[in-house]
């Protein structure tokens, strides 16, 4: 959870209107009872806005009262809005719910940018659109904040879907999801398709839009094309993976392949950018730079402060290079590939001054924390969390936008040696030195 | 310097009233959260009650929840403790004491420096 | 709520002693605990905040160590300046609670 802003990201229409929907491919993998299939009532159940966040409705309490929380992969806490705030249009109040249990600790969460602080208690949690369950979940009622509420988003809360390990105050605070599947039949997985409208929302089409789909316990064969691959998680914490080779239009970044995960790489639906280890960025800027030169762009650009823009509906895709993710795969020397397109990692803004424009963002950035696959990688795929099986599958997004030319893509096999070699050994500090991401 | 000056102590029935005050001044009031701490008479020190930097937060020992209220006019750089149904047990110094940041759970947001107390003596 | 338990009640030591003051708590309380040393008439000072960070002008001669119920402030070679009164305190649970204190007098 990551940039500039880390939590805050983006999302939008469901539909790809300026690109276009793939045909539905045959799934060559084996069925899974109660694991794939349909799961129509969870189809389309997040909306967002870009740059700020993909949010579910979730309800909590007795009476239920209802919130918009932000789904974030890359924290472990699932806390709301519980005092008034100049961003919040409503927030949780403990004091008219009969089933909430006071556990008397206090809690407070740093990001890189933002933070917020809070009191612990439990409560009745569910999903309206999601399974049929209630839970008893760790709340942190969020009494204090800085710069996390974002004004417009239209979310009061986070669910932070990732593991213990990571959870404050520490990692005895167990995260909804353990809840959920402790306390239910709900398989130990969610998938997530995250969908970029392409262009900027306002604030009316963003409530009337779709954003994509959380399906909790199971695969949904509609909102993807092709077959999924699979990464092993490598450590249950945040959700890490493995990159082993990136590759800017075919051309690899020849890196050792360690400076790739250093210090981590992480799948997190909370960040909006692409963001990647400082050589790494440097050596992609200089590549997609390279690959983009008839055209010259500002270094504020390159930076993400910038923005750049065409006359609408002339933006020249074509000039801008896919990259290219190698990922570990579940079978030893074997590797896949995730593709995406300048759709992706091109984030559509509005310019106030020239909105008869197509203005756009670059959504890669630098970090110092490792590589965090935010939305820009996951607008392009359905993402599937299998917790279960300690691995993360990606497939071609039935909703991400592209154009006649050229579509994301997950490929492979692909023999890659020495892919242990990859993943960087973090040193072991003291455990409140671990800053949640955010950026 | 940080200096925090507590006043409005004295003496009070059991049953009454009194509000504390606590006047700031050397620092950024509104960015620190502040607290409240007593010490009965030859006795150790007992936690009262806290409030984050924005007020947004506060919080109270079971002993007085209900009874007191803690508040702050970050406007007049002044943090407050209303005491009502006071009793005989209530007696005390009461001192102030400044948060770290404006958090209350930050790791080293803990409460320094403190007011030299006020005394409240709660007796018929 | 969490209590903390400070032995001994009292310590008494004679200058450039080593003292070792003792806190337990009731319950895990991570490392969300602090020294304060507080002399007769006056208020209070921090010495130690997060179980073993020392504050801002306090001398190397206080260390504290420990985390969850075992926790130990040592002054490691006693100054005519530390006889006081010392308290820890706990904020990771309601109500933050004190312990009931340890004297370190003059032996």
């Known amino acids: 959870t990551q940039h500039g802003i880390r939590l805050p990201l983006r999302s939008g229409l469901g539909g790809a209107p300026l690109g276009l929907r793939l045909p539905r491919e045959t799934d060559e993998e084996p069925e899974e009872p109660g694991r794939r299939g349909s799961f129509v009532e969870m189809v389309d159940n997040l909306r967002g806005k870009s740059g700020q966040g993909y949010y579910v409705e979730m309800t909590v309490g007795s009476p239920p009262q209802t919130l918009n929380i932000l789904v974030d992969t890359g924290s472990s806490n699932f806390a709301v809005g519980a005092a008034p705030h100049p961003f919040l249009h409503r927030y949780y109040q403990r004091q008219l719910s009969s089933t909430y249990r006071d556990l008397r600790k206090g809690v407070y969460v740093p990001y890189t940018q933002g933070k917020w602080e809070g009191e612990l208690g439990t409560d009745l949690v569910s999903i309206p659109h999601g399974p049929n369950v209630t839970v008893r979940a760790n709340i942190a009622a969020i009494t204090e904040s800085d710069k996390f509420f974002i004004n417009g988003s239209n979310w009061e809360g986070i669910l932070g879907l990732a593991y213990a390990e990571i959870a404050r105050p520490d990692d005895s605070l167990e995260p909804f999801f353990d809840s959920l599947v402790k306390q239910t039949h709900v398989p130990n997985l969610f998938s997530l398709q995250l969908c970029g409208a392409g262009f900027p929302l306002n604030q009316s089409e963003v409530l009337a839009s779709v954003g994509g789909s959380m399906i909790i316990g199971g695969i949904d064969h509609s909102l993807y094309t092709g077959s999924l691959w699979y990464t092993p998680i490598r450590r249950e914490w945040y959700y890490e993976v493995i990159i082993v080779r990136v590759e800017i239009n075919g051309q690899d970044l020849k890196m050792d392949c360690k400076e790739y995960n250093y210090d981590k790489s992480i799948v997190d639906s909370g960040t909006t950018n692409l963001r990647l280890p400082k050589k790494v960025f440097e050596a992609a800027v200089k590549s997609i730079k390279a690959a983009s030169s008839t055209e010259k762009f500002p270094d504020g650009f390159w930076l993400g402060e910038q923005l750049v823009c065409w006359q609408a509906g002339t933006t020249p895709w074509n000039i801008f290079p896919v990259i290219s993710l190698y990922l570990m795969g579940e079978v030893t020397n074997q590797s896949f590939r995730i593709t995406i397109l300048p759709q992706q990692y091109l984030r559509p803004v509005e310019d106030v001054a020239t909105s008869q424009d197509d203005c756009y963002k670059f959504a890669i950035s630098q970090s110092s924390t490792g590589t965090v696959m935010g939305a820009v990688i996951m607008e392009g795929f359905y993402v599937v969390f299998d917790r279960a099986r300690k691995r993360i599958g990606f497939a071609v997004s039935a909703c991400h936008v592209h154009d006649e030319f050229r579509t994301a893509a997950v490929e492979g096999p692909f023999v890659t040696l020495d892919m242990e070699d990859c993943g960087y050994n973090i040193p072991q500090t003291d455990e409140s030195t671990l800053m949640t991401g955010r950026a | 310097e940080v200096q925090l000056l507590e006043s409005g102590g004295g003496l009070v029935q059991p049953g009454g009233s009194l509000r504390l005050s606590c006047a700031a001044s050397?620092?950024?009031?509104?960015?620190?959260?502040m607290s409240w701490v007593r010490q009965a008479p030859g006795k150790g020190l007992e936690w009262v009650s806290a409030?984050?930097?924005?007020?947004?937060?506060?919080y109270y020992a079971d002993s007085v929840k209900g009874r007191f209220t803690i508040s702050r006019d970050n406007s007049k750089n002044t943090l407050y403790l209303q005491m009502d149904s006071l009793r005989a047990e209530d007696t005390a110094v009461y001192y102030c004491?400044?948060?770290?940041?404006?958090?209350?759970?930050?790791?080293?947001?803990?409460?320094?420096?403190w007011g030299q107390g006020t005394l409240v003596t709660v007796s018929s | 709520e969490i209590v903390l338990t400070q032995s001994p009640a009292t310590l008494s030591l004679s200058p450039g002693e080593r003292a070792t003051l003792s806190c337990r708590a009731s319950?895990?309380?991570?490392?969300?605990l602090a020294w304060y040393q507080q002399k007769p008439g006056q208020a209070p000072r921090l010495l130690i905040y997060d179980a073993s960070n020392r504050a801002t002008g306090i001398p190397a001669r206080f260390s504290g160590s420990g985390s969850g119920t075992d926790f130990t402030l040592t002054i490691s070679s006693l100054e005519p300046e530390d006889f006081a009164v010392y308290y820890c305190v706990q904020r990771s649970n309601f109500p933050w609670t004190f312990g009931g204190g340890t004297k370190v007098e003059i032996k």
């Open positions: 004491a400044k948060g770290g940041s404006q958090w209350l759970y930050a790791p080293g947001s803990w409460f320094d420096p």
């Open positions: 319950q895990s309380v991570s490392s969300y």
């Open positions: 050397g620092f950024t009031f509104g960015s620190y959260a």
């Open positions: 409030t984050s930097g924005s007020g947004g937060s506060t």
